[in-house]
């Protein structure tokens, strides 16, 4: 019996300033029960980039349709990229609980930002 895997297929993504960055993430199972969240950086100082249930993330949209059944695609798009967005982004599966606990993280995708073409 195989445990859920979090797959971030792109080790790195390069995006021109002002463009949108798509960060890919898929999982291999619908269990354990619990949410997916996106972070920039690792460790206790990591920055929450997207949490579907709580918070306001105006620059982030989900790639999969909101009505897609049995969704295993948790890719996101971040709009209007600036140099301040550079860093490594992690797709993280949580196990439902009180509170939710981190179950497994993807390997990360490094986002680099190119100068805006003149």
């Amino acid at each position: 019996e195989e445990e859920l895997q979090v797959i971030q297929p792109d080790k790195s993504v390069s995006v021109a300033a002002g463009e949108s960055a798509i960060l890919h993430c898929t999982v291999t199972s619908l269990i354990p029960v619990g949410p997916i969240q996106w972070f920039r950086g690792a460790g206790p100082a990591r920055e929450l980039i997207y949490n579907q249930k709580e918070g306001h993330f105006p620059r982030v949209t989900t790639v999969s349709e909101s009505t897609k059944r049995e969704n295993m695609d948790f890719s996101i798009s971040i709009s209007n990229i600036t140099p301040a967005d550079a860093g490594t982004y992690y797709c993280v599966k949580f196990r439902k609980g009180s509170p939710d606990t981190e179950f497994k993280s993807g390997a990360g995708t490094e986002l680099s930002v190119r100068a805006k073409p003149s």
Epitope: E1, E3, L4, T28, S29, L30, I31, P32, V33, G34, P35, I36, Q52, T62, S64, E65, S66, T67, K68, R69, E70, N71, F74, R95, K96, G97
Partner: antibody, heavy 120, light 108 residues
Framework: EVQLVESGGGVVQPGGSLRLSCAAS????????VSWVRQAPGKGLEWVST??????YYADSVKGRFTISRDNSKNTLYLQMNSLRAEDTAVYYC???????????????WGQGTLVTVSS | EIVLTQSPATLSVSPGERVTLSCRAS??????IAWYQQKPGQAPRLLIY???SRDTGIPARFSGSGSGTDFTLTISSLQSEDFGVYYC??????????FGGGTKVEIK
Amino acid sequence: EVQLVESGGGVVQPGGSLRLSCAASGFSFSIYAVSWVRQAPGKGLEWVSTIGADDTYYADSVKGRFTISRDNSKNTLYLQMNSLRAEDTAVYYCAKDSTVGWSGDFFDYWGQGTLVTVSS
Amino acid sequence: EIVLTQSPATLSVSPGERVTLSCRASQNVRSDIAWYQQKPGQAPRLLIYAASSRDTGIPARFSGSGSGTDFTLTISSLQSEDFGVYYCQQYYDWPPFTFGGGTKVEIK
């Protein structure tokens, strides 16, 4: 075609035990959460328990008395019910959990149910 | 625990009439609401999920709407086979999953 078939119901005395089974087919059982929902005679639906992988969740009314488990090699869900009370009398349904988008869970397929009667 | 209140408790309707069932949540559940139909002696059947998405094979006369705390299931033209009890369920915040008390739709 998704099928869920419950078994193991019956009459049991208060304080007794019973083990329900739910045989699943027609979907990749091992990657889905599955649940038990019950319905007392003439009453509404009450969620009992859900199991993901090894993560389990219970209604307060059954916590400490009921244990949900699964055997993915047999595509079977179980509910071990101990210290049964008269108020546990109900039809017990096995249900497949479904998700939508980044949310979940609701129940998209249900078995026909098995009746548990707790009476002396 | 999120409490779901359904109204009315019972509805007597003639075939062909439009039916509107209400489900009110005690707190915001966004669109994380499902609707089920249950006929006597049968298991519940999923009709609507995500407040307004019809499950596969559900006739177009069934529609769901609402978000936040107020939700509606509408049957545009009731058929004789639509009798039964209708339940809403929230899956925004669990455990526990909670169901409404149900609305019984009787055929006049």
